[in-house]
C-alpha cells in the first residue's frame, strides 16, 4: 500500500512539475524590466525564451518573436535546449510511469517489469528536473551579469541587436516557476525510484519440508527469506500464503495436514 502511495504521489508530483516546466518554457516573463531606482516609464518591457514583449500604460501589450536563430546569444540557445530536453524527458517519463503504476493493470505485466519501468521513469524525471533547474539557473546567471553590465551602460537586449541603455532586466516570474517545477519533477523522480525498490518482488521461497516430531504437530521450514537481487532479477511472483504453501513453480510439493505457514 505504501509503495503504491509513494509511486502514485511521485507520479502526481512529477506531472505537476513537468506541467510547470512546460508553462515556464512558454512564459514571456523570464526577465522583466527593473523598476527599482529607474526612471518611471510608460512602457514595461519583459522577455521570454521565444519573444520579447511590451505592456504600454495605454493597456496594450505587444510581443515580438526572436525571428533570428544565429543572432541570439549562445546562452539563450543553451537555455532553450535544456528546457526542451527537460520537457521531452519528462513527457517520456510520464508515459512510461503511467504503464508502471501499480494501480493500473496492463495484461499480465509482472511486478519486475513495473519496477523496471518505475525506475526508468524516476531517472527520467530526475534528469528532466535537473535540466529545468540548470536552464533556469543559467538564464538567471545571464541576467545578473547583464544587470551589472547595463548599470555600466553596456546592456543590449536579449536579442543582442539593439542598444537600449535605459532598460535593465531582473528575474521574471518564469524563473521562479521553473525552479519550483524543476524541484517538483526532481522530487517526483526520487519518489518513483524509492517506490521502485518496494515494487521489486522479493524471492521468498518457503520450501515446505515437514519434520514430524513424535507426539507433536510442529512444522519446521528451513530456508527463510532469500534476499532479492533487485528489480533486475528474474524472480517470479511467488504465492507464499497459499493453503498448501506451494509456489507456482513447485506444484509437485506434497503438503501434509500438519504444515502451517
Amino acid at each position: 500500500m505504501a509503495v503504491t502511495a509513494c509511486q502514485g504521489l511521485g507520479f502526481v508530483v512529477s506531472l505537476i512539475g513537468i506541467a510547470g516546466i512546460i508553462a515556464a518554457t512558454c512564459m514571456d516573463q523570464w526577465s522583466t524590466q527593473d523598476l527599482y531606482n529607474n526612471p518611471v516609464t510608460a512602457v514595461f518591457n519583459y522577455q521570454g525564451l521565444w519573444r520579447s514583449c511590451v505592456r504600454e500604460s495605454s493597456g496594450f501589450t505587444e510581443c515580438r518573436g526572436y525571428f533570428t536563430l544565429l543572432g541570439l546569444p549562445a546562452m539563450l540557445q543553451a537555455v532553450r535546449a535544456l528546457m526542451i530536453v527537460g520537457i521531452v524527458l519528462g513527457a517520456i517519463g510520464l508515459l512510461v510511469s503511467i504503464f508502471a503504476l501499480k494501480c493500473i493493470r496492463i495484461g499480465s505485466m509482472e511486478d519486475s517489469a513495473k519496477a523496471n519501468m518505475t525506475l526508468t521513469s524516476g531517472i527520467m524525471f530526475i534528469v528532466s528536473g535537473l535540466c529545468a533547474i540548470a536552464g533556469v539557473s543559467v538564464f538567471a546567471n545571464m541576467l545578473v551579469t547583464n544587470f551589472w553590465m547595463s548599470t555600466a551602460n553596456m546592456y543590449t537586449g536579449m536579442g543582442g541587436m539593439v542598444q537600449t541603455v535605459q532598460t535593465r532586466y531582473t528575474f521574471g516570474a518564469a524563473l521562479f516557476v521553473g525552479w519550483v517545477a524543476g524541484g517538483l519533477t526532481l522530487i517526483g523522480g526520487v519518489m518513483m525510484c524509492i517506490a521502485c525498490r518496494g515494487l521489486a518482488p522479493e524471492e521468498t521461497n518457503y520450501k515446505a519440508v515437514s519434520y514430524h516430531a513424535s507426539g507433536h504437530s510442529v512444522a519446521y521450514k528451513p530456508g527463510g527469506f532469500k534476499a532479492s537481487t533487485g528489480f533486475g532479477s528474474n524472480t517470479k511472483n511467488k504465492k507464499i500464503y497459499d493453503g498448501g504453501a506451494r509456489t507456482e513453480d513447485e506444484v509437485q510439493s506434497y503438503p501434509s495436514k500438519h504444515d502451517y505457514v
Epitope: P39, V40, T41, Y46, G59, M158
Partner: antibody
Framework: EVQLVESGGGLVQPGGSLRLSCAGS????????MSWVRQAPGKGLEWVSS???????YYLDSVKGRFTISRDNAKNTLYLQMSSLRAEDTAVYYC???????????WGQGTLVTVSS | DIVMTQSPDSLAVSLGERATINCKSS????????????LTWYQQKPGQPPKKLIY???TRESGVPDRFSGSGSGTDFTLTISSLQAEDLAVYYC?????????FGQGTKLEIK
C-alpha cells in the same frame, strides 16, 4: 462617434480650487488610460497627468500634491481636482485618451482655467 | 525629465515643397521589448485641439494623408511632409511616450513661404 467634452473651467483666485470634468460619449472611459494635457495661452503643450488601468496615477512634478486625477465609471467621466492654484496653472486643459504607442488619439475641445487675482 | 528639442522653431516652405521637422530626445525612446520608438507627432491648428499624425515614430494614424511620414530611432526623429498643402499650415509637436512625464517638444510652426 467618440466625443470628449471638458467642463468646469473658469476664473479662480490664486490658492483656490477647481474641478475639471471630462465626459465621454461613444467611449467607455474606464476601459482606457486617460490623460490631461494643458496649453498656456500662446505656448506649447504640457502633459499634466494620466490615469491607467488599476487606477494608477502619474503627475507632472509641478502639480504633484495639488492636482488629483480620478474617474467615475458610473458617470463615464474623468476628473481633475485642482487645488492651491497658481498663476502658472492658467491654460486650456484638454482631456485625451491614450491609445497605441501611448499616443493621445482622441482629444476634447478643452476648457480654459484662468488663475488671477 | 526627458527633454524634447524640436528644430527649427518655425519653418517657411513653399506649397508643393518638402517640409522637414526634427525632434531630439535627451534619452533613447526605443523599447527593447518590441523594438519600437515611443515618439508621437501631433498637428495643431489654431483654436483646435492637437491631432495625432504619427505614433511609434513611423506609424501613420489612419486617415492621415500619406504625404506625412515619420522616421528615426533612439534619440533622433524626423517628421516629413513630402508635398506641402495649404491645410498643413499648423504647429507640429513631438512627444515622448516612453518616460513619465510624457514631455512634448516646444513645437514647430509651419508657414507658407
Amino acid at each position: 462617434e467618440v466625443q470628449l467634452v471638458e467642463s468646469g473651467g473658469g476664473l479662480v483666485q490664486p490658492g483656490g480650487s477647481l474641478r475639471l470634468s471630462c465626459a465621454g460619449s461613444g467611449i467607455t472611459l474606464s476601459t482606457y488610460a486617460m490623460s490631461w494635457v494643458r496649453q498656456a495661452p500662446g505656448k506649447g503643450l504640457e502633459w499634466v497627468s494620466s490615469i491607467i488601468s488599476g487606477g494608477i496615477t502619474y503627475y507632472l512634478d509641478s502639480v504633484k500634491g495639488r492636482f488629483t486625477i480620478s474617474r467615475d465609471n458610473a458617470k463615464n467621466t474623468l476628473y481633475l481636482q485642482m487645488s492651491s492654484l497658481r498663476a502658472e496653472d492658467t491654460a486650456v486643459y484638454y482631456c485625451a485618451r491614450k491609445y497605441h504607442g501611448n499616443a493621445l488619439d482622441y482629444w476634447g475641445q478643452g476648457t480654459l482655467v484662468t488663475v488671477s487675482s | 525629465d526627458i527633454v524634447m528639442t524640436q528644430s527649427p522653431d518655425s519653418l517657411a516652405v513653399s506649397l508643393g515643397e518638402r517640409a522637414t521637422i526634427n525632434c531630439k530626445s535627451s534619452q533613447s525612446l526605443l523599447s527593447s521589448g518590441n523594438q519600437r520608438n515611443y515618439l508621437t507627432w501631433y498637428q495643431q491648428k489654431p483654436g483646435q485641439p492637437p491631432k495625432k499624425l504619427i505614433y511609434w515614430a513611423s506609424t501613420r494614424e489612419s486617415g492621415v494623408p500619406d504625404r506625412f511620414s515619420g522616421s528615426g530611432s533612439g534619440t533622433d526623429f524626423t517628421l516629413t511632409i513630402s508635398s506641402l498643402q495649404a491645410e498643413d499650415l499648423a504647429v507640429y509637436y513631438c512627444q515622448n511616450n516612453y518616460f513619465y512625464p510624457l514631455t512634448f517638444g516646444q513645437g514647430t510652426k509651419l508657414e507658407i513661404k
